[in-house]
């Protein structure tokens, strides 16, 4: 009779250990789904303010065609300035066009006046070929007016209304370009 | 927090090629873009190749041309396949995603390129 009430003892502690488990799962599964669900909040209340805001460009951002650049208020050399675009989900400035080159220019003009930007563009130190940072050529009439004469490495930037070059290490502003928005009105 | 895993390392002859792959999780609707680094003995960590979320790739000079940035559909996985290796690419590369906050990075593959 010791040994039934011996084993029936030791079932009901491998029991209360099985619900401890479940509880325990239930308790992390339970945590879990409200990581998830905060996760998804801050997603979903991300998406409806740009819903909401169904601007084409962010604030502070101006906008031409299907493009949105943003002219930045700090100083920094030509890789730092790529990393902040890339921050914002954007490029350095790739110009495409005489019109966008125009565009560009008069924006500049309005806000800040005759500063320089990086822009984009590097020189390959072998080759000496000017490429934009997704790997194409300029078109001809985009290519830097002046060479720089500089040992370390040449980056491109927009003054007034020229192209120029510059090491890449020296301080200037920086314009960043992205994709706007297509309206889905 | 966002997590990188990245895969694809190895040794491999000049001239040849590889592809890494970097996988986040967690919080990727923060990242706003995605890049590989690479770093080699000695020297400074340098942007190899970055790709938006809207799919505009950067690529540093030294790659263009050999390399290709790109992603899966869900943006969740970036790769970075890498043709005509030659020495001086031997790196630990490291995969970047870039916030407006923080920036978080992977623990790194190796390439070796060597006959």
């Known amino acids: 009779k010791l040994l039934q009430v011996s084993t029936i003892a030791m079932q009901q502690q491998e029991k209360l250990i099985q619900q401890e488990r479940a509880l325990l799962n239930f308790t992390e599964w339970k945590r879990s789904c409200a990581l998830q669900m905060k996760y998804c909040q801050a997603f979903m209340q991300n998406s409806l303010s740009s819903a909401h805001n169904s601007s084409p460009c962010p604030n502070n951002w101006i906008q031409n065609r299907e493009s949105c650049y943003y002219v930045s208020e700090i100083w920094s050399i030509w890789h730092t300035s790529q990393e902040n675009c890339l921050k914002e989900g954007s490029t350095l400035l790739q110009i495409e066009s005489k019109e966008e080159m125009d565009f560009i220019t008069g924006s500049l003009r309005k806000i800040k006046g005759s500063y320089d930007y990086w822009v984009g563009l590097s020189q390959d130190g072998h080759s000496g070929r000017w490429l934009w940072q997704d790997g194409s050529s300029p078109s001809p009439g985009l290519l830097p007016a002046e060479r720089s004469q500089s040992a370390n490495q040449v980056c491109g930037y927009v003054k007034s209304n020229s192209l120029l070059s510059s090491n890449c290490s020296t301080w200037k502003y920086f314009i960043c370009e992205k994709y706007a928005l297509r309206s889905s009105v | 927090d966002v997590q990188l895993v990245e895969s694809g390392g190895g040794l491999v002859q000049p001239g040849g090629s590889l592809r890494l792959s970097c996988a986040a999780s967690?919080?990727?609707?923060?990242?706003?873009?995605m890049g590989w680094y690479r770093q080699a003995p000695g020297k400074q960590r340098e942007l190899v190749a970055a790709i938006t979320n809207q799919g505009a790739p950067t690529y540093a000079d030294s790659v263009k041309g050999r390399f290709t940035i790109s992603r899966d559909n869900s943006g969740n996985t970036v790769y970075l396949q890498m043709n005509s290796l030659r020495p001086e690419d031997t790196a630990v590369y490291y995969c970047k995603a870039f916030t407006r906050g923080d920036d978080y990075w992977g623990q790194g593959t190796l390439v070796t390129v060597s006959s």
């Open positions: 967690g919080r990727i609707f923060s990242v706003n873009a």
